[in-house]
């Protein structure tokens, strides 16, 4: 059988280096070897690269060295195929040098800022020594902050009379780590070289960019002051290295700016006690370069009605986050507020708040929280500056069996019936949302009996027992993940009854 | 047998046109190049013309510049030399030869290369100008 | 273009002495487009070294080729009678193509 046809012939200039040619198909089914015929010098000159002998042959590739590598040049290609029953020749090609000319990558030396220019970086490099001297190179620059995953990229040529290697990257982010990496061209070629060795550069440092400040209301104490806890961190969007030497406070009451109080803390939480009234919020953070904008929060009065608009909400897991919906009445609302803790016996060591704007629903990677906890999930619809009811729901992101199960305990023991009730799992021993308990009784020497009851029942009577009889008994508590086992208690039904 | 046959060699006057024709067997015509090469009577050889496989000119000697034009048919396993604008100094035997792929020793590296040379001539045909 | 100078450009030798012409290029021309052909009398011309110093099927090892950039040389290591003609070189590296004026080896 004659070989195939070679055909997709690719070739591509490695500049200085060699000019090689691939094909397909890639395998023959029998021994076949190639010739590539080759008219370089503008058709003044040809020549053969082949793979003619058994260690090279079925091996789709061909390689011209130098020194019959001309540049610029055009060169015709035909590939031959020959096995021992013939030869099979390609269609004929062209290739134009400048077209498919591939380079080093260029080195960058240095990623800096230049004094007194806000948010830039200057990039220089060493334009790649294996280059054509005269030729126009293209670039694509390659940047990202230091901790994302993705690339942004700019294009941009320079011409070899220039001699200035260097692009100024504008429009970045202050005080900013960026990561660089820059890969280059002819201008006429269709093959980038590869990427150079990324480099790393920082943006000069500026007045902190701003603050997301939000509050709990705590009840009223005794003497009538409200506790409101506040709480500030950097503003989406600001800066990964920015660091604030401190924060000033200052709020008053409602259309009495004569009452400002004013504090100064490093924290980034402060407790300030109110009165009944409504009062307003500032919070500034500053550095050595200045301050940040003002963020404002605007404190209810003790007995101001807060709207309501939140209708439903719906916590869902995908595979790698938790993504909460809700659905609302008011269309105007485009801005809310999301807090998560978790739902523990104690005082909730760690509080979380984050803010949404024109979407209803929020997401968060589920390594961000920790399995096996549940957290509470409370979503307040914002409006300008009023701050609505919120709407909270719970969940897990991953859930596991209980860590114990149900303390049991036998009560009212009859001659044929028995009522068992049981404790509710400590909240940091579920692992899950407890969806049924399982109650397994079983007579000395008889068979085993199982009744399961919803999540919410802790108390059950069991009948049809027989009297005077022995039976083991415990209660199975479970989640989606299992069930766990409680203590097994024993009980005797009586032989007559007590009334 | 590998052959190269050579006509339309003739007398003709200075200014005039004359086409040769090589006629090319025993091997296959569309993987070699082909030249045309002249000999002046009791004078040395001087390449006029040639055309690679691919159907590209490799170009013309300076003296024949913009005069001559060299083609070639694979389909008849041909090669012509079109002569216009005759002149004395062209009155030679020319020759068709043939250019075929010759290995040079292994240069090292994955693969073995050829580089085309003429191997084969034809007898030549006689062209004359003269008034 | 590419000139050729052959020297010298005739030579007469006994039979079983060697022989040696020498081709001198204008400028540098790549060892791999250097040829020597030898054009018997009456007869067309044939090839007999290419690419510098390969010998071409058919030639007598007593035909060798050596040189690089612009000095090229043929060697008859033992003439012999049939050895007669006229021999060319010729430079395939710039264009046009070029051959050196000949020199004819004759037999004393």
């Known amino acids: 059988v004659l070989p195939a046809k070679p055909e997709n012939i690719s070739c591509i200039f490695y500049y200085e280096e060699n000019f090689t040619c691939t094909w397909s198909p890639e395998k023959e089914a029998s021994y076949t070897w190639y010739k590539v015929k080759r008219t370089y010098s503008y058709g003044y000159k040809s020549d053969i690269c082949s793979t003619d002998n058994s260690t090279r042959g079925n091996h789709a590739s061909c390689s011209f060295l130098p020194p019959t590598i001309t540049n610029p040049d055009n060169y015709t290609i035909q590939v031959e195929a020959q096995n021992a029953d013939g030869i099979m020749k390609s269609d004929i090609t062209y290739w134009n040098l400048d077209a498919i000319m591939k380079i080093e990558p260029p080195e960058i030396f240095s990623v800096k800022s230049v004094l007194g220019i806000k948010r830039m970086l200057q990039i220089k490099w060493i334009r790649p020594v294996l280059a054509p001297h005269s030729s126009t190179l293209k670039y694509t620059l390659r940047f990202r902050t230091i901790n994302s995953a993705y690339w942004m990229e700019v294009n941009f040529t320079k011409e070899d009379i220039d001699r200035d290697e260097t692009y100024n990257l504008t429009e970045l982010q202050a005080f900013t780590e960026y990561v660089m990496t820059l890969r280059c061209a002819p201008a006429e070629s269709m093959f980038w070289s590869g990427w150079s060795q990324e480099k790393v550069g920082t943006t000069e440092e500026e007045a902190p960019y701003g603050l997301d400040l939000w509050r709990v209301l705590k009840p009223a104490m005794v003497d009538g002051r409200r506790p409101v806890q506040l709480m500030w961190k950097k503003a989406t969007g600001a800066p990964v290295l920015e660091k604030a030497l401190g924060y000033n406070i200052w709020y008053f009451p409602e259309n009495n700016t004569n009452l400002t109080e004013t504090v100064n803390t490093t924290n980034q939480t402060h407790e300030l006690y109110l009165g009944g009234k409504t009062y307003w919020v500032y919070v500034v953070s500053y550095n050595s370069l200045g301050e940040s904008p003002v963020a404002t929060l605007r404190i209810p009065a003790l007995n101001e009605k807060t709207f309501q608009c939140i209708e439903a909400m719906q916590a869902c897991l995908t595979q790698d986050q938790l993504v909460v919906e809700w659905q609302s009445s008011a269309p105007e609302v485009d801005t809310w507020m999301v807090e998560w803790f978790p739902d523990v016996d104690s005082e909730p060591s760690s509080f979380s708040w984050e803010s949404v704007s024109q979407a209803r629903n929020w997401t968060i990677q589920k390594d961000e929280l920790k399995p096996l906890w549940c957290y509470n999930i409370s979503v307040y619809p914002v409006l300008r500056d009023r701050v609505g009811q919120p709407y909270s729901t719970q969940a897990y992101v991953q859930e596991g069996i209980p860590s114990a199960g149900p303390v049991t305990q036998a009560d009212s023991i009859g001659v044929k019936t028995v009522t068992i009730t049981w404790k509710e799992i400590p909240k940091s021993k579920r692992n899950g949302f407890i969806k049924n308990y399982t109650i397994f009784y079983q007579a000395e020497d008889g068979k085993e009996f199982s009744k399961t009851v919803n999540s919410n029942i802790l108390q059950y009577r069991l009948e049809s027992l027989t009297r005077r009889t022995s039976y083991s008994l415990q209660v199975m508590a479970s989640t989606n993940a299992g069930g766990t086992n409680g203590t097994k208690i024993n009980f005797k039904t009586l032989s007559i009854s007590v009334l | 047998e590998v052959q190269l046959v050579e006509s339309g060699g003739d007398l003709v006057k200075p200014g005039g046109s004359l086409r040769l024709s090589c006629v090319a067997s025993g091997f296959t015509f569309d993987d070699y190049g082909m030249s045309w090469v002249r000999q002046a009577p009791g004078k040395g050889l001087q390449w006029v013309s040639g055309i690679n496989w691919a159907g590209g000119t490799i170009g013309y000697a300076d003296a024949v510049k913009g005069r001559f034009t060299i083609s070639r048919d694979n389909a008849r396993n041909t090669v012509y030399l079109q002569m216009n604008s005759l002149r004395a100094e062209d009155t030679a035997v020319y020759y068709c030869?043939?250019?075929?792929?010759?290995?040079?020793?292994?240069?090292?590296?994955?693969?073995?290369?050829?580089?085309?040379?003429?191997?084969?001539w034809g007898q030549g045909t006689l062209v004359t100008v003269s008034s | 273009e590419v000139v050729m100078i052959q020297t010298p450009l005739s030579l007469s030798v006994s039979p079983g002495e060697p022989a040696s012409i020498s081709c001198r290029a204008s400028?540098?021309?790549?060892?791999?487009?250097l040829v020597w052909y030898l054009q018997k009398p009456g007869q067309s011309p044939q090839l007999l070294i290419y690419?510098?110093?390969s010998r071409a099927t058919g030639v007598s090892d007593r035909f060798s080729g050596s040189g690089s950039g612009t000095d090229f040389t043929l060697r008859i290591s033992r003439v012999e009678a049939e050895d007669v003609g006229v021999y060319y070189c010729?430079?395939?590296?710039?264009?046009?193509?070029?051959f050196g004026q000949g020199t004819k080896v004759e037999i004393k």
């Open positions: 400028q540098s021309v790549s060892s791999r487009y």
């Open positions: 690419g510098t110093s």
């Open positions: 010729q430079q395939y590296d710039n264009a046009p193509r070029t």
């Open positions: 030869a043939r250019e075929s792929p010759l290995r040079l020793g292994d240069l090292g590296g994955d693969y073995f290369y050829y580089y085309y040379y003429i191997d084969v």
